[in-house]
């Protein structure tokens, strides 16, 4: 029985987060939706999954693992580029496939040191190792040397028995809020804040009627809307103050006019 290689977590105790909100604890908020999100864990210095309730919470919440890493891990993009250029792969890229102790059937990717490619595998959902990526792209960026990957990845079709395992609330609900248009609509590139502040208000899927606020990127203000109690999106705050605090800081005006803070 051969011993598995250790997870080679480097000692990062002194690492400072890029933003103060990266140090916040994961906060699922008071609502009952189940939206798979990611937060930066100050203790492990990694971005990790958590289930967001759909409203409130805090700024340490991201829609994708990649966005979390880019925002909160110092030098992440440089490391990814370095790995992609074939300079240095993290040690965990060489760990053997470990489906873990549980059997939750999650579709994941790992770097195969034999084929020098990222390949799909079935992760059980708990206690595997760090050679385990949510997306093929992320695996390639971190572990795959592009020199070795002109051919496409050979993926076994596992769709018959693999589910993604995302308990994600359906966000395709038609938005019944009319967002007033303004001639002074800031372009997306003029907004440097949280991406969900650009989302339209979404009343959600349930039948309650709760007073909430959403950030209107067209007006730069927070407006009231009725929230039904579940689902919806992250542009959803219990008070106008929280809404402004979370979203207003990201609006960047013309350089000549300074920055809105």
């Amino acid at each position: 029985l051969s011993e598995e290689a250790d997870d080679t977590d480097s000692e990062l105790g002194s690492m400072k987060p890029l933003h103060t909100f990266c140090a916040m604890k994961a906060d699922d908020g008071p609502c009952k939706a189940m939206i798979r999100s990611y937060f930066f864990n100050m203790y492990t210095h990694q971005c990790e999954e958590f289930i967001y309730g759909g409203c409130e919470g805090n700024e340490n919440r991201f829609d994708t693992l990649e966005e979390c890493k880019k925002t909160c891990i110092p030098g992440y993009e440089k490391t990814a580029v370095k790995a992609a250029s074939g300079a240095e792969r993290p040690d965990f890229c060489f760990l053997e496939e470990d489906p873990g102790l549980c059997r939750g059937y999650m579709k994941r990717y790992l770097y195969n040191n034999q084929t020098k490619q990222c390949e799909r595998f079935v992760y059980g959902g708990c206690l595997g190792n760090r050679n385990n990526f949510e997306t093929l792209d992320e695996c390639k960026k971190i572990c795959e040397n592009p020199v070795h990957s002109p051919s496409p990845v050979n993926e076994v079709q596992m769709s018959d028995y693999v589910t993604d395992g995302n308990t994600v609330t359906d966000r395709s609900t038609v938005n019944n809020i009319v967002v007033p248009q303004s001639p002074k609509v800031p372009r997306r590139r003029d907004y440097r804040g949280r991406p969900w502040c650009l989302q339209p208000a979404d009343s959600g899927l349930c039948k309650a009627s709760e007073r909430r606020f959403y950030y209107n990127s067209a007006t730069g203000k927070c407006h009231r809307f009725n929230y039904t109690g579940c689902g919806g999106n992250n542009n959803n705050f219990t008070t106008r103050r929280r809404c402004l605090r979370s979203c207003k800081t990201g609006l960047i005006k013309n350089k000549s006019k300074g920055v809105v803070k």
Epitope: E4, A26, T44, E48, P99, L101, R103, G124, G125, C126
Partner: antibody
């Protein structure tokens, strides 16, 4: 009904090897929906997880760093059991040792435990 | 290692009254598919531990509905709505977010 029956000596001399066996009935050590673990309990350290083995496409093991250099957990598929070997024991290793099944399917927890074996390390 | 800290360490209870045990992890535990990577066990006097609550809030088979588990992030709670004499023993929380698997130091529940 799963049952785990432990066997092995209750007294081991310092520097020797502690060996315990856990016989499984009602499940298979090679099952891909379970994992097999050893856990010990002492007044000073409470419940301490020592290591685990599990079979998926191949056998895997994981050990606690505190005992990693001294521990081996092996499956015996012919007898449907698994064993614990802990080398170079000291009085610090005196504890009640439990084998346990980790349910990989439903519970994601230790849902069956052996009866426990008190192992005393003393000369 | 993730350190699990339970409080109180000793809990004298009156039958029929509620009881609550807290478990705090040294770092946030993963939540996936709505399940928290935390279990609760009860070790009755002279017995092996038994699984009580799994995945944070699900009762194991045969566990009475007076037991409930809740919490997320780093703070978790086991509640007994009405304590019965058979509930005495030591309660342990256990995380399986990362290796090594770790247990709390235990909370001893005894009848007043």
């Amino acid at each position: 009904q799963v049952q785990l029956q432990q066997s092995g000596p209750g007294l081991v001399k310092p520097s020797q090897t502690l060996s315990l066996t856990c016989a499984i009935s009602g499940d298979s050590v090679s099952s891909d929906s379970a994992a097999w673990s050893w856990i010990r309990q002492s007044p000073g350290r409470g419940l301490e997880w020592l290591g685990i083995i599990y079979k998926r496409s191949k056998w895997y093991n994981r050990y606690a760093v505190s005992v990693k250099s001294r521990i081996t957990i092996n499956p015996d598929t012919s007898k449907n059991q698994f064993s614990l070997q802990l080398n170079s024991v000291t009085p610090e290793d005196t504890a009640v040792y439990y084998c346990a099944r980790w349910d990989s399917d439903k519970h994601w927890g230790f849902d069956y435990w052996g009866q426990g074996t008190l192992v005393t390390v003393s000369s | 290692d993730i350190v699990m800290t339970q409080s109180p360490l000793s809990l004298p209870v009156t039958p029929g009254e509620p009881a609550s045990i807290s478990c705090r992890s040294s770092q946030s535990l993963v939540i996936s598919r709505g399940n928290t990577y935390l279990n609760w066990y009860l070790q009755k006097p002279g017995q092996s531990p038994q699984l009580l609550i799994y995945k944070g809030s699900n009762r194991a088979s045969g566990v009475p509905d007076r037991f409930s588990g809740s919490g997320s992030g780093t703070d978790f709670t086991l509640k007994i709505s009405r304590v019965e004499a058979e509930d005495v023993g030591v309660y342990y929380c256990q995380q399986y977010d990362s290796y090594p698997l770790t247990f709390g130091q235990g909370t001893k529940v005894e009848i007043k």
